[in-house]
Amino acid sequence: PLATIPVSTTSLTSSEGSTISTPSVDISTPVTTSIVGDQCSRCKNGGFWDGLKCQCLTPYYGESCEEVVNSIDIAPPETVSAQMELTVTVTSVKFTDELKNHSSQEFREFNKTFTEQMNIVYSGIPEYVGVNITNLRLGSVVVEHDVLLRTKYTPEYKTALDNATEVVKQKITKVTTEQIMTNDNCSALMCFNTTGTQVQNITVTQYDPVEECRQKAEEYEDYFLVEYRDQKPYCISPCESGFNASKNCNHGKCQMSQNGARCLCVTTETHWYSGEDCNQGTQKSHHHHHH
């Protein structure tokens, strides 16, 4: 069952013996009550009681899953890839029915020669992984194949793969224009029909750290953002320190609520702190204002 708990003012004692005042807010927090056996525990925000403690769902933590984490793990893939579907026409080999059978000696030999030829063609492309023949058909031999590209994930991976696909197009166009039959004979490893070269389709890995961050932040999606460090994306709230978007709470503690990040100001033995960033100090004895 869901219960509605009003959030009231609480005082937290800081490490220096000071207290943190949390003002009353007009939002209500839904509470899920999970019951396992005789043990009844209020695990909030979709968390569940495992018999010992609350198991919290992202982005929550704490004894009752009532607090919001400052950062969420997002894991971009180690590598990203692109697959290009190409067709070339090989004229230096005549088509036979055995080429349709991928376990035949004919297909294996053709595959070996074609792979060798393409490895030479694409040798200067660092993203090039290899080729995979998907189909062979009559005319002399029409080779439907995939060119596989891969690169390390960086924020600019799409540009890197897009550039690589362009170089693939240039190189295959060049080789199929230059390596052609003369007098019904081929002096190259393979010869081609220039007009038979086509790029059918290009598929690039889709990974968006911002989207993953927003999804994992759930109802806090508007307040979590992605920042990069050493080309690695971090999904952070403004309460996470050390980033451009970090909120400076000065004499206070940053806390996430459903309205965003806010500062909970400290009250020490000598001062009250207030203001949005807890940067306004009032001396208790003289009621003197500091900015």
């Epitope: 080999v93 005549k94 004919e106």
Partner: nanobody
Amino acid sequence: DVQLVESGGGLVQPGGSLRLSCAASDNTFSRGSMSWFRQAPGKEREGVAIISSDGWTGYADSVKGRFTISQDNAKNSLYLQMNSLRAEDTAVYYCAASFLVLRALNPKAWHYWGQGTMVTVSS
């Protein structure tokens, strides 16, 4: 495993003739292609002649009209009849085979090779 064994090489005078033979271990190439290549000392291996299962034959320009390639599928054998031999024909002659119906005189396009037989044309 496929094996190719050449024979028929030797010493011959300029203008003379020789017939090279290549015996294949089985008839797997009867539906593909067979060829002769040669390699002169200090030079790259070059294509001499091809014969394919569809009846097509191809020759290097340097041997056209002088050399003839033929095949006997019943005997799993390939032949090269060499007439009007010249000093520049001196080389090790290799038999090569492919399961593919090839039109390529590039040695890299061929996957199966014999050990070679030496042909020396000298007076």
